[in-house]
């Protein structure tokens, strides 16, 4: 079976994947929106804000097929991808325009799923095998969480769901995807 690519509403090409897409990769190109060109945070943006509304998290819709071994969903499903780093909302548009991206040098901020929804899909199989019904877990919304280093980089601190919504009137821009991401394996990735 070949790679079937299709577009989402942010004009991003997404390969066909299994139940769960590969987590968004850490992009190596330091001029992408997920990296500061010179690393660290600029001194005039001290990391002291306590206002959750100052933090923004990007939600991109994308469409994919669900696979289970040789079987594939009759229709594609649409879900969200929680995009990259979180930073103060007031800095996001301008920072991108300058080719800069705010990123704290201390705690790491992650844009990760906030809520999931279940959707039943019908999987069609080759060779006359009976269709299979599966219920898949799809990302329904995203939020910013803080990753603190004193927790072995594994404990995520929730900034709350209020920070999870993209700002109104600003359509998310497509994320650059690395070659590695586009070569994600097509397997029965549940």
């Amino acid at each position: 079976q070949g790679w079937q690519a299709f577009k989402n509403d942010a004009t991003e090409i997404i390969p066909e994947l299994g139940e769960y897409p590969e987590p968004p990769p850490e992009l190596e190109n330091n001029k992408t929106m997920n990296r500061a060109e010179n690393g660290g945070r600029p001194p005039h943006h001290p990391f002291e804000t306590k206002d959750v509304s100052e933090y923004s998290c990007r939600e991109l819709h994308f469409t994919r097929y669900v696979t289970d071994g040789p079987c594939r969903s009759a229709k594609p499903v649409t879900e969200l991808v929680c995009s990259g780093q979180c930073g103060p909302a007031r800095l996001l548009p301008n920072a991108i325009g300058r080719g800069k991206w705010w990123r704290p040098s201390g705690p790491d901020f992650r844009c990760i799923p906030d809520r999931y929804r279940a959707q039943r899909v019908q999987l069609l199989c080759p060779g006359g095998e009976a269709p299979r019904a599966r219920k898949v877990r799809l990302v329904a919304s995203c939020k910013c969480k803080r990753l603190t280093r004193f927790h072995n980089q594994s404990e995520l601190k929730d900034f709350g769901t209020e920070a999870a919504r993209p700002q109104k009137g600003r359509k998310p821009r497509p994320r650059a995807r690395s070659a590695k991401a586009n070569q994600a394996e097509l397997e029965n990735a549940y």
Epitope: P21, P24, P113, Y116, R117, R120, L156, E185, A189, Y190
Partner: antibody
Framework: QVQLVESGGGLVQPGGSLRLSCAAS????????LSWVRQAPGKGLEWVSV???????YYADSVKGRFTISRDNSKNTLYLQMNSLRAEDTAVYYC??????????WGQGTLVTVSS | DIALTQPASVSGSPGQSITISCTGT?????????VSWYQQHPGKAPKLMIY???NRPSGVSNRFSGSKSGNTASLTISGLQAEDEADYYC???????????FGGGTKLTVL
């Protein structure tokens, strides 16, 4: 074939810490949700924690604030850091792969004994 | 999440059929396609026997079947065999899809 192998269990005193590991092979690790499930001696199964493919983590109320689940996709390994251990945490701990909202593969388990 | 309720034990003779029930609230088993069953022999890891209420993984005997009516899911084993003697657990997920709940387990004895 899919394999999950737990390690790191042992005897620890109440209040102590332990880190369990689960080495995975035979599937694309980063694309799957993974859980820890435990079973106290002579008792039933109890779900402990799960990590999603995007780094999100979730816990049973009984371990929240004491246990931390994490994954290293580069090493195909799942971890469970257990702090402030109590006698009631004594159990065999299994890691399990979450497939379409059920567990299709389980490790053989590792025994954690909390006793003074 | 509220625990799922199973009978502590059931028994049957070889060749007979038995049914193990699993009852919960609507958020646990009231939704379609969300109950799985696991078999566990003493000292062994659990093994998935039924998923999505009534689907069998490859390699599981067709003597095992699942069903659901209202808030009660059931596992039926037909043509009982000695090797079926084990503990059986039902399981479902929480409303958030990020937590799980198991039944208390049922010990099956083949007489």
């Amino acid at each position: 074939q899919v394999q999950l192998v737990e390690s790191g269990g042992g005897l620890v005193q109440p209040g102590g810490s332990l880190r369990l590991s689960c080495a995975a092979s035979g599937f694309t690790f980063r694309s799957h949700w993974l859980s820890w499930v435990r079973q106290a001696p002579g008792k039933g199964l109890e779900w402990v924690s799960v990590t999603g493919v995007h780094g999100d983590t979730y816990y049973a109320d009984s371990v929240k604030g004491r246990f931390t689940i994490s994954r290293d996709n580069s090493k195909n390994t799942l971890y469970l850091q257990m702090n402030s251990l109590r006698a009631e945490d004594t159990a065999v701990y299994y890691c399990a792969r979450d497939t379409y909202l059920h567990f299709d593969y389980w490790g053989q388990g590792t025994l954690v004994t909390v006793s003074s | 999440d509220i625990a799922l309720t199973q009978p502590a034990s059931v028994s049957g003779s070889p060749g007979q059929s038995i049914t193990i029930s699993c009852t919960g609230t609507s958020s646990d088993v009231g939704d379609i396609n969300d109950v799985s069953w696991y078999q566990q022999h003493p000292g062994k890891a659990p093994k998935l026997m039924i998923y999505d209420v009534n689907n069998r993984p490859s390699g599981v005997s067709n003597r095992f079947s699942g069903s659901k009516s209202g808030n009660t899911a059931s596992l039926t084993i037909s043509g009982l065999q000695a090797e079926d003697e084990a503990d059986y657990y039902c399981s479902s997920y929480g409303e958030s899809l990020t937590s799980y709940v198991f039944g208390g387990g049922t010990k099956l004895t083949v007489l």
